[in-house]
Interface confidence: low
């Protein structure tokens, strides 16, 4: 910003310093320089002198007009050519912004990731506003009527310790910026219904050379939730379409899931879980790759997830754990 200039005059914008993108705007500059009757007044946008649409209004004032202004931000300042001054004299400067009022926030979602100690609330903010937009998340207890408000620029993490008003809450989001304010619909939540189990992780895979070769995927979670439903999806890396298997799971021991796969093909696996009967799923786990052997048994462990495959022998390879799923935000 250039709001701290020691001004020798005044610069202002009509209709306002922050305005709706695409509007026609006027920028006025009025000089108040000692011993100077300006010969000429100049406008600069982002340091570049403007040459068109400038109108001299009177001895000390000029107007710059922009049609359909589309830049999100610009730094404007104006200068005067004073007689007996070799250089232009700075009059004043102003930062201007254009953008949009916020859309109504929708798809408000609140979840508690097991062990996180937080309720995480997110929403779809709608189209880009281009200007500073703040969100106020309202959390109101349906039991005590007590309401808490949280100011944020995006999503919010609310400590579950601060949710002292029982289990049932209403949550809604207000979006506000200089051009407008909107409010979401209210979401009713029960804290017990929004817990997402601790992440499920695929640790290794092996293909057993039986009459029909069988691949076993080993996977686990640290969840303490008793009734958990999971999905494992898999596909050949050359395919677009996923196959999905469903499981009712008890994580008191490592899970083993069996697949009958084509030989000598590279497959990718992912898993996700939810508390049985509840609404929200985990994001899909990291991509886990396994190449089925031509005929000889092969093991792939979570530790070995490079794209290097030894043909013929049992392979163990180590995963860095940084591969991410293609839709890691899928919790709905």
């Amino acid at each position: 910003g250039i709001t701290n200039i020691n001004c020798s005059g005044h610069i202002w914008v009509e209709p306002a310093t922050i305005f709706k993108m695409g509007m026609n705007i006027s920028i006025y500059c009025q000089a108040a320089i000692k011993n100077c009757q300006p010969r000429k007044l100049h406008f600069y946008k982002n340091g570049i002198k403007e040459r068109f649409q400038i109108t001299r209004i009177n001895k000390t004032t000029a107007r710059l007009w922009y049609k359909n202004f589309l830049e999100p931000h610009a730094s404007m300042y104006c200068t005067a050519e004073c007689p007996k001054h070799f250089q232009e004299t700075l009059i004043c400067g102003k930062d201007i912004s254009s953008g949009y009022p916020p859309d109504i926030p929708d798809e408000v979602t609140c979840v508690i990731y097991e062990y996180s100690g937080n309720m995480t609330c997110t929403w779809n903010a709608g189209k880009l506003t281009y200007i500073d937009t703040k969100y106020v998340v309202h959390v109101k207890s349906l039991e005590t009527e007590e309401e808490q408000q949280y100011l944020t620029s995006s999503y919010i993490n609310i400590s579950t310790d601060s949710l002292q008003g029982g289990k049932k809450y209403l949550v809604w989001v207000q979006a506000a910026n200089a051009l407008g304010m909107e409010e979401s619909k209210q979401l009713q939540i029960h804290l017990d219904d929004i817990v997402i189990p601790s992440a499920a992780v695929i640790s290794r895979a092996e293909t057993i050379n039986a009459t029909v070769p069988k691949t076993i995927i080993y996977w686990d979670s640290q969840t303490t939730i008793e009734k958990v439903s999971c999905e494992m999806r898999y596909k050949a890396t050359t395919n677009q379409t996923w196959n999905v298997k469903e499981f009712d799971t008890n994580f008191t021991y490592v899970q083993q899931s069996e697949f009958y796969l084509e030989p000598n093909i590279k497959y990718v696996f992912q898993v996700r879980c939810q508390e049985t009967g509840k609404r929200y799923w985990q994001p899909w786990s990291s991509l886990f790759f396994h190449k089925t052997p031509e005929t000889v048994p092969q093991v792939t462990s979570k530790a070995f997830q490079h794209d290097t495959w030894n043909s013929g022998l049992t392979v163990a390879s180590i995963s860095t754990g940084h591969l991410t799923s293609d839709n890691r935000g899928d919790i709905g």
């Epitope: 910003g1 250039i2 982002n46 340091g47 730094s75 300042y77 400067g93 930062d95």
Partner: nanobody, 124 residues
């Protein structure tokens, strides 16, 4: 971030002159603006003069107009503040600063690069 080192401060009598130098650790981009700020004890840090490298556009605070001159040497990557007709009220720590924003003179907090400061004392 560009490292800036000032030099040239000292004690001078009222009416005298000093030349401050500010050397940058690396070549600055053409959109770069260099400035000299000063801070007297108990006062805020104020911009004294600024120069934009792309077109040599300069700015001076009213209190120093006609007495101070800001200039630069591209080859040496250095900015100078020539201070003539010094007054007792010019006594302060002088800081060199720089930024690459499009605005010539953003608020103090927008200047990301700062020198360590050099003391200028003007005695009567």
């Amino acid at each position: 971030e560009v490292q800036l080192v000032e030099s040239g401060g000292g004690l001078v009598q009222a009416g005298g002159s000093l030349r401050l130098s500010c050397a940058a650790s690396e070549r600055t981009v053409s959109t770069y603006t260099s400035g000299w700020f000063r801070q007297a004890p108990g006062k805020e840090r104020d911009l004294v003069a600024a120069i934009r490298w792309s077109d040599d556009f300069t700015y001076y605070a009213d209190s120093v107009k006609g007495r101070f001159t800001i200039s630069r040497d591209n080859a040496k990557n250095t900015v100078y503040l020539q201070m003539n007709s010094l007054k007792v009220e010019d006594t302060a720590v002088y800081y060199c600063a720089g930024h690459s924003f499009s605005a010539l003179i953003p608020p103090v907090s927008f200047w990301p690069s700062w020198g360590q400061g050099t003391q200028v004392t003007v005695s009567s």
